[in-house]
Interface confidence: low
C-alpha cells in the first residue's frame, strides 16, 4: 500500500484497490493505508467511506485519531471489532453512520482507550447488546472514555422490531436503555443523541447512570410525555432538546426537575400542546421561567378552539376541560 | 455459568504436531476472546495467542508464530490450537482463557501435553 | 516487550501479617490493563484484581492493588492461610501480553 503523506491535513493516500481477505497478525506499518481506504497520517484521519465494507479493516493504522466508516454493509459489529495488537491508543473518533449494522455485540468498542466520541446513527440496530459500550465482561463495568454518543436514527423498520409495532417499541426502548445504564461505564458521558428514534416515552431508568450530561437531543421521537423520565440527577444539563415530539403537556414534577437544574436551556417547539385545564401549571411556569429557548413560539394545537393561540398569552379562563380529546392523542 | 473445557492430556512424539480444544458454554461464543496461555512445570506463564470467534481475528505472540494455529468453529463454540515441530521445551500444561482488556475472567482446567520419544 | 519483574520471588508470612508484593514494568502499562491472577498447585490461574485495583469477584476485601506507570502492587492487609499461592501480574496493554515471573507466598 502507498505511503501517507504527512505534508498537507487535507492530502490522502488511497490504497491498492483490492480488499484484503486475510487478518493480519501483526501490527500495521505506520504507513500502512488499508484496502479501499483513504489516510491522512497529518490529520490522523482515515476514511473508508461508502465502500461497502462488509467487515472493519484489520491494518488499521497506529496512529489513527479519527476514523471514518461511514456507508458500508457492516451488518454486525463482533466483540472486539477494533481490537489491535498494540491497541488503537489514538482513537478519538468513530464514525459508523449508515453502515446497516443491525448488530452490536458486547465488547464491541474495548480497547479502544481514548475512545470519546462515536456515532451509530442512521444504522437499523435491532440488536443492541447491554454490554455494547461497557465491555464483554458481564461482571466488569470499567468506565468507558466516551464523551458523546451520537444514536440518532438507529431504529429497526417495524417489520424488524419484536413483537408488531407498540411491543417493538417498548422493547426497542428498553434495549436502548439497557445499553446506556449498563453498569457505571458511561458516567462521563456529555453528549447523547437519540433523535428520530420513534420513542414513545423514556424508560424510567435512561438517564440514572449518565451523571455527566450536558447535552441531550430527544427531538423528532414520539414522546407524549416526560411523566416517567427523571431529569433530577442530570446537574451539568445544558441543552435537552424536545422539539417535534408528541407532548401535550408538562407536569408539575417534570417543571420543577427542569427549573430545579442550574444551567438547564429546553427546546420544546413543534409539540402539539394540547390546551386545556391541565395546561394551567405549565403556562404558569412558562411565564416565569427563564429555561425555554423560544417560548414565544409555543403554541397550541389542540383543542380546535384554541390551535395556534400562543401559550405565553394564555390565561386561566381560556383553559378548560370540557373538550373530548381525539383517540390519538389520549395516554393511559 | 460460564465453562471452558479442554481436552485431554496428550503423549506426542518430537516433529510432530497436535491439535488440542477447548470448548466453551455457558455465553455467548461470538462475543469473547479465547487466549492460549503455556506454562511449564514449576514455571510462570506465556501468553501463546488470542482469536475473537466473531470476526476471526487472531494475534500471536511472535515467539510462538509459524508453530501455534488458532482457530475457532462457531457452530460448536469450540476453540482449538495447533502447534507444530514439537520438541521437549513444548511439555507444558495449555490452558485457554476467556476475556479480555480487563482480564481472564475464566479459564479451563489446562491440557498436559507431553513430547517424548 | 514488556518485560514485568516480580519481587520478590518467594515471600514468606505469618498469619495477620500485612503483605506487599510488586511487580515492576519495563515501559509504562496504561493501568486499566495490569491485573493480577492467583494460582494455586495444580489448579488453574484465577483473576483475582483487574484494571490496578478492582477486585474480581469472590476476592475478599483484605487484598488491594495499587500503582500506576511502571510500579504496580497487590497487598494482603492480613495474611490467611488460604492467601498462600503464586500470584502473577499481567499486563493486556501491549502484544505480546506478558505476565510476571511470580511470587510464591507462603505461610510462614
Known amino acids: 500500500s502507498s505511503s501517507s503523506p504527512t505534508s498537507s491535513a487535507s492530502s490522502f493516500s488511497s490504497s491498492a484497490p483490492f480488499l484484503a481477505s486475510a487478518v493480519s497478525a501483526q501490527p500495521p506499518l505506520p504507513d500502512q493505508c488499508p484496502a479501499l481506504c483513504e489516510c491522512s497520517e497529518a490529520a490522523r484521519t482515515v476514511k473508508c467511506v461508502n465502500r461497502n465494507l462488509t467487515e472493519v479493516p484489520t491494518d488499521l493504522p497506529a496512529y489513527v485519531r479519527n476514523l471514518f466508516l461511514t456507508g458500508n454493509q457492516l451488518a454486525v459489529l463482533p466483540a472486539g471489532a477494533f481490537a489491535r495488537r498494540p491497541p488503537l491508543a489514538e482513537l478519538a473518533a468513530l464514525n459508523l453512520s449508515g453502515s446497516r449494522l443491525d448488530e452490536v455485540r458486547a465488547g464491541a468498542f474495548e480497547h479502544l482507550p481514548s475512545l470519546r466520541q462515536l456515532d451509530l446513527s442512521h444504522n437499523p440496530l435491532a440488536d443492541l447488546s447491554p454490554f455494547a459500550f461497557s465491555g464483554s465482561n458481564a461482571s466488569v463495568s470499567a468506565p468507558s472514555p466516551l464523551e458523546e454518543l451520537i444514536l440518532n436514527h438507529i431504529v429497526p423498520p417495524e417489520d424488524q422490531r419484536q413483537n408488531g409495532s407498540f411491543e417493538g417499541m417498548v422493547a426497542f426502548e428498553g434495549m436502548v436503555a439497557a445499553a446506556l445504564r449498563s453498569g457505571l461505564a458511561l458516567r462521563g458521558l456529555t453528549r447523547l443523541e437519540l433523535a428520530s428514534n420513534h420513542f414513545l416515552f423514556l424508560p424510567r431508568d435512561l438517564l440514572a447512570q449518565l451523571p455527566s450530561l450536558r447535552y441531550l437531543d430527544l427531538r423528532n421521537n414520539s414522546l407524549v410525555s416526560l411523566t416517567y423520565a427523571s431529569f433530577r440527577n442530570l446537574t451539568h444539563l445544558e441543552s435537552l432538546h424536545l422539539e417535534d415530539n408528541a407532548l401535550k403537556v408538562l407536569h408539575n414534577g417534570t417543571l420543577a426537575e427542569l427549573q430545579g437544574l442550574p444551567h438547564i436551556r429546553v427546546f420544546l417547539d413543534n409539540n402539539p400542546w394540547v390546551c386545556d385545564c391541565h395546561m394551567a401549571d405549565m403556562v404558569t411556569w412558562l411565564k416565569e421561567t427563564e429555561v425555554v429557548q423560544g417560548k414565544d413560539r409555543l403554541t397550541c394545537a389542540y383543542p380546535e378552539k384554541m390551535r395556534n393561540r400562543v401559550l405565553l398569552e394564555l390565561n386561566s379562563a381560556d383553559l378548560d376541560c370540557d373538550p373530548i380529546l381525539p383517540p390519538s392523542l389520549q395516554t393511559s | 455459568q460460564v465453562q471452558l473445557q479442554q481436552s485431554r492430556p496428550e503423549l506426542v512424539k518430537p516433529g510432530a504436531s497436535v491439535k488440542m480444544s477447548c470448548k466453551a458454554s455457558?455465553?455467548?461464543?461470538?462475543?469473547?476472546?479465547i487466549s492460549w496461555v503455556k506454562q511449564r512445570t514449576g514455571q510462570g506463564l506465556e501468553w501463546i495467542g488470542e482469536i475473537y470467534p466473531g470476526s476471526n481475528s487472531i494475534y500471536y505472540n511472535e515467539k510462538f508464530k509459524g508453530r501455534a494455529t488458532l482457530t475457532a468453529d462457531k457452530s460448536s463454540s469450540t476453540a482449538y490450537m495447533q502447534l507444530s515441530s514439537l520438541t521437549s521445551e513444548d511439555s507444558a500444561v495449555y490452558f485457554c482463557?476467556?476475556?479480555?482488556?480487563?482480564?481472564?475472567?475464566?479459564w479451563g482446567q489446562g491440557t498436559t501435553l507431553t513430547v517424548s520419544s | 516487550q514488556i518485560v514485568l519483574t516480580q519481587s520478590p520471588a518467594i515471600m514468606s508470612a505469618s498469619l495477620g501479617e500485612r503483605v506487599t508484593l510488586t511487580c515492576t514494568a519495563s515501559?509504562?502499562?496504561?493501568?486499566?490493563?495490569l491485573h493480577w491472577y492467583q494460582q494455586k498447585p495444580g489448579s488453574s490461574p484465577k483473576l483475582w484484581i483487574y484494571?490496578?485495583?478492582n477486585l474480581a469477584s469472590g476476592v475478599p476485601a483484605r487484598f488491594s492493588g495499587s500503582g500506576s506507570g511502571t510500579s504496580y502492587s497487590l497487598t494482603i492487609s492480613s495474611m490467611e492461610a488460604e492467601d498462600a499461592a503464586t500470584y502473577y501480574c499481567?499486563?493486556?496493554?501491549?502484544?505480546?501480553?506478558?505476565f510476571g515471573a511470580g511470587t510464591k507466598l507462603e505461610l510462614k
Open positions: 499481567h499486563q493486556y496493554h501491549r502484544s505480546p501480553l506478558t
Open positions: 482463557a476467556m476475556g479480555g482488556n480487563y482480564g481472564f475472567d475464566y
Open positions: 455457558g455465553y455467548t461464543f461470538t462475543d469473547y476472546v
Open positions: 484494571s490496578t485495583s
Open positions: 515501559s509504562s502499562v496504561n493501568s486499566n490493563y
